[in-house]
Interface confidence: low
């Protein structure tokens, strides 16, 4: 029931005011003006963004699970924000830890050669039966972001006359007959259909896809970045290893595909102040407009330090904009000397193709340890994962509405296939919350100086969280 406040005695009003002040401590505020959508509601919980009818309703809301959870998160967030700045000794220790980890966990040149040999061997086996096909290594083996146990990603290039499903079925048969491979199986229901097998000699798991061009383009981009920006590879390796420890890198269990972590590092390095990596598209391109960014398609890496782009003027955005411009022109007084801003904009997109640099002019002077800490802080406190899209193409932050991607917990745009959210496999609120919690724990752990042989539990969460991640229980929003 809504109280008619004009009928209250001063004493009652005092009581009401006292109650409202108490509510404010719980982030529940009286609305100055009632919302037209919620005409009965007198209060708003700014923490949960919930409209509340009256005092009783507010007290009931305070007891709700979601409000208590949000209060705890708010407290934790302010704790994390108030952590003291790390000392230079702390940052130096972090730098050493990241470099050591990258050396220990990453693949060596010898490991890479083994992986390349696997592709060579498999090429011989497959091309005996399918001479028009060729095999290529892609993924983390090629980018050098692979951990020692990472799978070997192999893609088959095939001529257009060949049928994709038939080809994979043939490959399955060929590999089954070869003595070089064991445990040969198909996974044709995966997002990217593959033949999976184990290389007998190295015991490495191979995942063989066909015509997976987009993944190969992303591989080329990340590999090129690893070559031109020295901090990129160790940061990605540390991030991937952390994700593996936390068991959030398993796509089949509703986690995030491992190459997403490389895109997340790239995005962070672009967004930090000052940035350490440039965005792939921007105002240096004549006529570039972020609102029409999808008219500019990324086409691959050139000279190992540029990304090639093409402008496609036949897109729907272009047609809509031209229609809008024509309408604007029709409404204008006829004056040939006056050029409208929209006219200039549409004429400006003269450049039909070009290349963007993968690095900035100024060399990076930031210690690796500091970047590691900043990376964790960025995804823990600075970037709202649930609201925005991780997009490495432009400097502007994209909202979910921009991409029309509402319900995903983490959205990461594939730079070469922009309609694709590569973190789509993370589709459970439970897992999302777990990932957020792991970020918080990691940031707290690395931001606070650790004593030798101190508390290891934060970085070894497998026991506690493994069960939590694969839990299939539904999550309530309250």
């Amino acid at each position: 029931t809504v109280i008619d406040e004009s009928a209250l005695t001063p004493e009652q009003r005092l009581g009401l005011k006292q109650a409202e002040e108490r509510l404010e401590r719980d982030h529940i505020f009286r609305l100055e003006k009632r919302s037209p959508e919620y005409t009965n509601c007198r209060y708003l919980c700014k923490l949960c963004l919930i409209h509340i009818e009256n005092i009783q309703g507010a007290h009931k809301h305070i007891k709700e699970k979601r409000h208590k959870k949000n209060i705890l998160e708010k407290q934790e967030e302010s704790e994390l924000r108030s952590l003291p700045s790390p000392s230079s000794a702390h940052l130096a220790a972090l730098s050493v830890a990241v470099v050591e980890l990258a050396k220990e966990q990453g693949i060596t040149d010898d490991d890479l050669r083994i992986r390349q040999d696997i592709v060579e061997e498999m090429s011989k086996v497959i091309m005996t039966f399918l001479p028009e096909c060729s095999l290529r290594l892609y993924g983390s083996s090629l980018t050098k972001f692979a951990l020692k146990s990472s799978d070997v990603n192999i893609d088959i290039k095939f001529p257009p006359k060949m049928n994709h499903p038939d080809l994979l079925i043939q490959v399955l048969g060929i590999l089954k007959k070869s003595a070089l491979y064991i445990d040969v199986e198909s996974d044709f229901h995966a997002k990217v259909p593959v033949v999976v097998c184990k290389d007998r000699k190295s015991a490495l798991l191979c995942r063989v896809s066909a015509g997976n061009d987009m993944a190969c383009l992303t591989t080329d981009l990340l590999a090129a970045l690893g070559k031109v920006e020295p901090v990129f590879t160790p940061l990605v390796l540390a991030f991937r290893y952390w994700a593996k420890l936390c068991y959030i890198d398993s796509q089949t269990d509703g986690g995030i595909p491992s190459y997403c972590f490389a895109l997340m590092v790239m995005f962070f390095l672009q967004q930090r102040k000052p940035p350490l990596l440039p965005c792939l598209l921007g105002s240096w391109i004549e006529g570039f407009d972020p609102k029409r960014m999808d008219d500019f398609q990324l086409k691959g890496i050139v000279e190992e330090k540029f990304v090639k782009w093409e402008y496609n003027s036949s897109s729907a955005t272009e047609k809509n904009l031209i229609a809008d411009e024509n309408k604007a022109k029709a409404d204008e007084p006829k004056d040939d000397t006056k050029k409208t801003e929209t006219d200039n904009q549409s004429n400006a997109a003269k450049a039909k193709h070009g290349k963007s640099p993968l690095t900035l002019e100024a060399p990076n002077q930031v210690p690796l340890g500091q970047l590691w800490l900043e990376l964790l802080k960025f995804y823990t406190l600075d970037f709202a994962l649930e609201e925005y899209v991780i997009c490495v193409r432009i400097q502007d932050i994209l909202t979910r509405e921009n991409k029309n991607w509402p319900k995903r917990r983490i959205a990461i745009e594939d730079p070469f296939s922009v309609k694709r959210n590569v973190a789509r496999s993370l589709n459970s609120q439970l897992v999302y919350e777990y990932v957020v919690e792991r970020f918080r724990a990691a940031y707290r752990y690395f931001a606070c100086p650790q004593k030798k042989g101190g508390n290891k539990s934060t970085m070894d969460p497998k026991k506690k969280e493994k069960g939590k991640l694969s839990s299939k229980k539904p999550v309530k929003s309250d």
């Epitope: 319900k407 589709n427 459970s428 609120q429 897992v431 299939k472």
Partner: nanobody, 118 residues
Framework: QVQLQESGGGLVQAGGSLRLSCAAS????????MGWYRQAPGKEREFVAG???????YYADSVKGRFTISRDNAKNTVYLQMNSLKPEDTAVYYC????????????WGQGTQVTVSS
């Protein structure tokens, strides 16, 4: 992967009642809609009733006032209380769980037969 298990179907006389249940298991969004559809022999599958996570309900005109949909979010279960049943309600009733913003995220049960005799 999501599995849906319906129960509660059967043979009932016109004017009688039945309560269908559908339990969802597996990894599901916390904010999906749950609903019931039906398919009579030789006819297209049609929407019967749906309910949002928050409890807002929607019904097909043909069942309004007779059928009531409800859900237990903690148990991931949706129910359909069917009263004043008519012979034209005879069909296989399917439970569905889905995200209206993502057509690829839509799961169906195996169906449960409801037969209303006159």
């Amino acid at each position: 992967q999501v599995q849906l298990q319906e129960s509660g179907g059967g043979l009932v006389q016109a004017g009688g009642s039945l309560r269908l249940s559908c339990a969802a298991s597996g990894t599901i969004f916390y904010d999906v809609i749950m609903g019931w559809y039906r398919q009579a022999p030789g006819k297209e599958r049609e929407f019967v009733a749906g309910i949002t996570y928050g409890g807002t309900t929607y019904y097909a005109d043909s069942v309004k006032g007779r059928f009531t949909i409800s859900r237990d979010n903690a148990k991931n279960t949706v129910y359909l209380q069917m009263n004043s049943l008519k012979p034209e309600d005879t069909a296989v009733y399917y439970c569905a769980v889905g995200d209206p913003t993502d057509p690829s995220y839509y799961y169906w049960g195996q169906g449960t037969q409801v037969t209303v005799s006159s």
